[in-house]
Each structure stands twice: as structure tokens, then as C-alpha cells.
Amino acid sequence: HNTTVFQGVAGQSLQVSCPYDSMKHWGRRKAWCRQLGEKGPCQRVVSTHNLWLLSFLRRWNGSTAITDDTLGGTLTITLRNLQPHDAGLYQCQSLHGSEADTLRKVLVEVLADPLDHRDAGDLWFPGESESFEDAHVEHSISRSLLEGEIPFPPTS
């Protein structure tokens, strides 16, 4: 799996999308997890509704939300009130029994300032000889922080 980069600005919201084959993953719940160590499992942050038919309903855990368009084949994760501690490696997963297939590996980068990212035409990409090939960077549409929003602490 290549890693897709989503960049957001501290204090704003970041939307991460994970496309998948809707037929292949028909009937499967999805999850969003965080890689907190070099080894060991990806730690679950939030998963879609227990009833697959209700996967379109947004589920929250702290400041992280998940919703699944099962017909269109797009899992969407929203990280609200993005902060530096949200930066890191994540995975979108498709669940079947006790197993989980990785739909997409995601690197979340949290910028201190909207002007800190390079414009799309000016983005620097690692060369093919590097360990992460075909880096793909997305600048998510974000909005200002709502009063009283609290960051979600990482699972320990």
C-alpha cells in the first residue's frame, strides 16, 4: 500500500477520504485506526455503525467522526479541531470477522499555518527510489474551530 498524505491546519477540521470497491467490501463494517508504534496492531479510533445498513450514520469518538457511503464506495473520516498530536500514520480498514483489510494508509500532517503548505504545482514529491513511492498529497477543505471543541487524546 502506498501512503496518501492529508494535510490540515491546526485548529481546523480535516476530512480524509478512503475509496474502495463497493462490491468487494459489500456488507463489511469499516474502521479508522492509528499506528502508534513501529510494531504492534493499529489501534482502533472509531468504527462505523454496528448495523452495516446504517453505516451512512456519522459516528463520533471524541473529535473523530466516521461515515461510510457503501454504494459509492467511499469511507470518510473527519478530524475536528486538528492539533499537532493528531499527526501520524493511520489506516482505513474493512472489517470481516476478527480480520481487517487495509483500504488505505494515510499520513496526517498538521500545519501550524495555512501558508505553510506548498501549492499543488509546487509540491515536492519523493523520488521513485525512496521507500514511499507516488506520494499523493491532498489539502482537505477545513473550517474554523467551534468554541468548546475538545481534542481526542490518542489511545494509549
Epitope: 494535510q7 499506528q35 499537532p84 498530536h85 503548505h117 506548498r118 519523493p126
Partner: antibody, heavy 120, light 107 residues
Framework: EVQLQQSGPELVRTGASVKISCRAS????????IHWVKQTHGRSLEWIGY????????SYNQKFKGKATFTVDTSSSTAYMQFNSLTSEDSAVYYC?????????????WGQGTSVTVSS | DIVMTQSHKFMSTSVGDRVNITCKAS??????VAWYQQKPGQSPKLLIY???TRHTGVPDRFTGSGSGTDFTLTISNVQSEDLADYFC?????????FGAGTKLELK
């Protein structure tokens, strides 16, 4: 073993600029971040900012915005920090430090430091 | 900016002792805290991240704890090589900030 090799000490005039290099070895440069940290009087540490070796994205401490500029040369696995319009307040030891994508802000390996002395 | 306060600039200890180095954040930083050790003339070394996760190769006599605003680095069975400066750092909010340091010295 992971190593970050920084350029040597600098003695510069007030108003001049300085460019410090930080060469990484024994790890995949593009999988990590390079942070820059200022240390004065061998005590207090100040985070200047970081550059992503993966995307080239930067984040600066507002205090150093316009003063510091980060760049990377992936072909030589080297990160650079340029410091402009130097004053006596900028005399310090500057460190580069690595962090991983998994823990982007736990700086797990540090360079040996570059001493910058600003003289009038 | 979040201020990380290390109330003890110096702490005296003896070899074999147990010592607690504390750090207080001016606002909630969840568990986004790291601890570093720095010996004279050397670069800082990462000991702990995520408040309690020990970095690879760090002896298990170093333990981190705390969440929210209060954090502690505990060194049990202090060794002579542990005499150094210890800094806490928060990465919950920009800019990332460090404590002023606590110097661990022999009684």
C-alpha cells in the same frame, strides 16, 4: 545506526545570514521529519519548526517565521536551515532532530549541534 | 503558547534512590508529552513519548506517567550515568514547547 551530522560552528556579523546543514544517514530520509531546535546558555530549548522529508511541508514557530527557512535536498539526505538578519539574540546552539511519521513530535535522534556566534 | 513548568531547577539524589521529576502544563495537553535527557556537552536524548511510552533502548528504570496537565518522569534505582538535565516537551499545540529543565545532581 541513525546519524545526523551537522555543519561546523559559525561566527557571523550582525545583520548577516547563516545556513546550517544536517545530513542524515542510515535511515530513509523521506519517511521522517526534521525539526530544528535552539538552545541558549546550555539550558532552555526552543522549537523553531520542522520540515517533512516526505512532502516538503513545513511548520514554523510563529516567533521564527521570516527569520528561519527550511529546505531539504533528498538526493543527499540533507536538511538546511537558513537564519536571516542575525542579531546577538540569535547566538545559540542549533540542533536538528529527527522524528518519525508514527510519532511526529518525539524527536528520537539529534545532531551534535551547530554553535552560531553573532558578533558586531 | 503552552508553558511547561518544571518547578525544580535542581534535584539532589543518591545512587540507588528513586526520584520523581515533575512537569506541569499551563493547559490540557492530553498525553502529548515527551521527556529528554541531556548530559553536559551532548545533544538531548529522547526517553519517553506519549507521556508513558519508553523509547527504544531506554532502560526500564525510566518511567513516564500523567495526563492532562501534570506529568512525572520517575527514575528508580538512580545510576551515576543518570546525572543530567531532564526536559519535558508538549506536542499538543503549536508551537511545541519545552520545560526549562531539571538538573539531577548527587547529594
Amino acid at each position: 545506526e541513525v546519524q545526523l551530522q551537522q555543519s561546523g560552528p559559525e561566527l557571523v556579523r550582525t545583520g548577516a545570514s547563516v545556513k546550517i546543514s544536517c545530513r542524515a544517514s542510515s535511515y530513509s530520509f523521506t519517511d521522517n521529519y526534521i525539526h530544528w531546535v535552539k538552545q541558549t546558555h546550555g539550558r532552555s530549548l526552543e522549537w523553531i519548526g520542522y520540515i517533512s522529508g516526505y512532502t516538503g511541508a513545513t511548520s514554523y514557530n510563529q516567533k521564527f517565521k521570516g527569520k528561519a527557512t527550511f529546505t531539504v535536498d533528498t538526493s543527499s539526505s540533507t536538511a538546511y536551515m537558513q537564519f536571516n538578519s542575525l542579531t546577538s539574540e540569535d547566538s545559540a546552539v542549533y540542533y536538528c532532530a529527527r522524528s518519525t511519521m508514527i510519532a511526529p513530535y518525539g524527536m528520537d535522534y539529534w545532531g551534535q549541534g551547530t554553535s552560531v556566534t553573532v558578533s558586531s | 503558547d503552552i508553558v511547561m513548568t518544571q518547578s525544580h531547577k535542581f534535584m539532589s539524589t543518591s545512587v540507588g534512590d528513586r526520584v520523581n521529576i515533575t512537569c506541569k502544563a499551563s493547559q490540557d495537553v492530553v498525553t502529548a508529552v515527551a521527556w529528554y535527557q541531556q548530559k553536559p556537552g551532548q545533544s538531548p536524548k529522547l526517553l519517553i513519548y506519549w507521556a508513558s511510552t519508553r523509547h527504544t533502548g531506554v532502560p526500564d528504570r525510566f518511567t513516564g506517567s500523567g495526563s492532562g496537565t501534570d506529568f512525572t518522569l520517575t527514575i528508580s534505582n538512580v545510576q551515576s550515568e543518570d546525572l543530567a538535565d531532564y526536559f519535558c516537551q508538549q506536542y499538543s499545540r503549536y508551537p511545541l514547547t519545552f520545560g526549562a529543565g531539571t538538573k539531577l545532581e548527587l547529594k
